[in-house]
């Protein structure tokens, strides 16, 4: 399956926080989305192959890495002034 | 590769039919439809892969356009349990 952690996160002003996303489905592609209350998903970053990732529609204030097929951590940087949201990770073949 | 869904909001009577659409200017190798209930993560309903494909899931019918740039979700005889946020992803 696909596992995201932590389930809840509080961030101090000016801090960077990292959300973990791990999958054991052998999927090549991984995605991070942000969902604000009552809204649909907006793509932050996606990766289709190890060592490569591309910006989605709202990449500002976020960073990612893809060093392993199984893992695609998302860092919410201090530059993200409005980080409060529901974050979703997804994977696909 | 932005996907646009329409309509954004839909309120119907029980027993009515409804169709929601998902469009893009880009080609997708596959499209997924999800349903999300308040406070929960999205639940995958279906993945469509082949252009022109039609998939049925009880009262739900999913279509993938021939050019693989659009998809639709049709619900026949909607019920209160169908209430939720429907999301299209590619």
């Amino acid at each position: 399956g696909i596992t995201q952690s932590p389930k809840y996160l509080f961030r101090k002003e000016g801090q960077n926080v990292t959300l973990s996303c791990e999958q054991n489905l052998n999927h090549d592609a991984m995605y991070w989305y942000r969902q604000d209350p009552g809204q649909g998903l907006r793509l932050i970053y996606y990766s289709q192959i190890v060592n490569d990732f591309q910006k989605g529609d709202i990449a500002e204030g976020y960073s990612v890495s893809r060093e392993k097929k199984e893992s695609f951590p998302l860092t919410v940087t201090s530059a993200q002034k409005n980080p409060t949201a529901f974050y979703l990770c997804a994977s696909s073949i | 590769q932005l996907l646009e869904q329409s309509p954004q909001f839909l309120s119907i009577q029980e027993g009515e039919n409804l169709t929601v659409y998902c469009n893009s200017s880009s080609v997708f190798s596959s499209l997924q439809w999800y349903r999300q209930e308040p406070g929960e993560g999205p639940v995958l309903l279906v993945t469509v892969v082949t252009g022109g494909e039609v998939k049925k899931l009880k009262r739900l019918t999913f279509q993938f356009g021939d050019a693989r740039k659009d998809s639709s979700l049709h619900i026949t005889a909607a019920q209160t349990g169908d209430t939720g946020l429907y999301l299209c992803a590619g």
Partner: antibody, heavy 120, light 107 residues
Framework: EVQLQESGPELVKPGASVKMSCKAS????????MHWVKQSHGKSLEWIGY????????NYNQKFKGKATLTVNKSSSTAYMELRSLTSEDSAVYFC?????????????WGQGTSVTVSS | DIKMTQSPASLSMAIGEKVTIRCITI??????MNWYQQKPGEPPKLLFS???TLRPGVPSRFSSSGYGSDFAFTIENMLSEDVADYYC?????????FGAGTKLELK
């Protein structure tokens, strides 16, 4: 029918730069990645990098960072590769090749190649 | 980078014989292996893509197998038109990497 038409052979002096082109037809240019591959005489193939014409995203093989620059012109469906500070090691045939954007598959259609000779 | 060890470097076979080329990777790449044929003066031609998928128009005498780190490309009954260089390519990981190639000649 998918076609990738590459520019003609180049004879250039050491230290100079060269910019080659690859004109795509028969498909929607922005729907697919464009890769560039080097083949030195009698040798194997080396992947240089790729560009996504839709958003200009590039990814380079570390070995070619600073040597190659990939660009596109969407309106003419043309991809370009510029090589700088040329040496005899850069003498080779360079191919452009396309691959689908999603999923990330191998290159399925290739140009005929551009021969670059670096000589004083 | 994922290193690809392709063998043999060259091969001389008679018409009708079975040809096998191997490619071994230093790390597991699942089924993300591709095989190309290149004839003199031409660009490479994709024969098999990921998942041992035979590409359209490629003769059925060609086959490909393997998963993980050990892969094989086979020509069941060699024909004179199969004389070419053959390359494996991994597409699991960037940078994409090719094998050193196998030159197939007619005996």
């Amino acid at each position: 029918e998918v076609q990738l038409q590459e520019s003609g052979p180049e004879l250039v002096k050491p230290g100079a730069s060269v910019k080659m082109s690859c004109k795509a037809s028969g498909y929607t240019f922005t729907d697919d990645n464009m890769h560039w591959v080097k083949q030195s005489h009698g040798k194997s193939l080396e992947w240089i990098g790729y560009i996504n014409p839709n958003n200009n995203h590039t990814n380079y093989n570390q070995k070619f960072k600073g040597k190659a620059t990939l660009t596109v012109n969407k309106s003419s469906s043309t991809a370009y590769m510029e090589l700088r500070s040329l040496t005899s090691e850069d003498s080779a045939v360079y191919f452009c090749a396309r691959s689908t954007v999603v999923p990330f598959y191998a290159m399925d259609y290739w140009g005929q190649g551009t021969s670059v000779t670096v000589s004083s | 980078d994922i290193k690809m060890t392709q063998s043999p470097a060259s091969l001389s076979m008679a018409i009708g014989e079975k040809v096998t080329i191997r490619c071994i990777t230093i790390t597991d790449i699942d089924d993300d292996m591709n095989w190309y044929q290149q004839k003199p003066g031409e660009p490479p031609k994709l024969l098999f893509s990921e998942g041992n998928t035979l590409r359209p128009g490629v003769p059925s005498r060609f086959s490909s197998s393997g998963y993980g780190s050990d892969f094989a490309f086979t020509i069941e009954n060699m024909l004179s038109e199969d004389v070419a260089d053959y390359y494996c390519l991994q597409s699991d990981n960037l940078p994409l990497t090719f094998g050193a190639g196998t030159k197939l000649e007619l005996k």
